[in-house]
Interface confidence: low
Amino acid sequence: KPVSLSYRCPCRFFESHVARANVKHLKILNTPNCALQIVARLKNNNRQVCIDPKLKWIQEYLEKALNKRFKM
């Protein structure tokens, strides 16, 4: 495989043009020494992209996920 495509952190660059409706599922990666890594699998083409954690809907999603975790 091309060395050029392997990153120390899975996400070094983030896509900010991702609609919530086009996301099949999200993966939050706990990678040491890396910024928050959120990988989305897209519905329309099954590709994986790294999503910008600053997206409003992502922040709302994370907030809800954290609230759920602490309520349990």
């Epitope: 091309p2 495509l5 590709r47 994986q48 992209v49």
Partner: antibody, heavy 124, light 107 residues
Amino acid sequence: QVQLVQSGGGLVQPGGSLRLSCAASGFTFSSYWMSWVRQAPGKGLEWVANMNQDGSEKYYVDSVKGRFTISRDNAKNSLYLQMNSLRAEDTAVYYCARDLTGPYYYDYYGMDVWGQGTTVTVSS
Amino acid sequence: DIQMIQSPSSLSASVGDRVTITCRASQGISSALAWYQQKPGKAPKLLIYDASSLESGVPSRFSGSGSGTDFTLTISSLQPEDFATYYCQQFNSYPRTFGQGTKVEIK
């Protein structure tokens, strides 16, 4: 909509220089690898160069190494190809393209968005 | 460099025909292969990536298969708009070489 608009082609003498530009819109330009591909008259496609999102990795086909330089300005959503020491065999239509790689090294997605192409003619 | 050899270099077919184009890599490239369609005077269009994944918006009559060194693009029922030149491209290593192209013409 997602698009790449090219400019900068033309007629140049052998040994001359030319800079091609590619303006991106409709997507997060700074998140993508970008490529240049060319097509000589009546011939097939030839991959020329590509670079990663922040410009720290650049790759070239052997025939242009040392003569062509790929660069980008993420603030301007633009990709460039500086072509020096041009030869007759560089005559071609040049395309810029969005080069899709996923977050993991094993994700290969091809080039899904292309510019309209710009013609470079090297002749005396 | 990895050489990509397409066959045939051209073919004549009729609307409704099943068309198969092959691409052979000079060394193994896993599934790191894409297929493009190009019409005269136009930019290429991505059809298939990762050897067999259909690009969004591409008709389902197009399909790709293969892994390693041998790959196939199939058009299950050729339509008038499919007459064009088709290219494979490997993404396994640099330089990212293309096949020489296969021109699909009307019989």
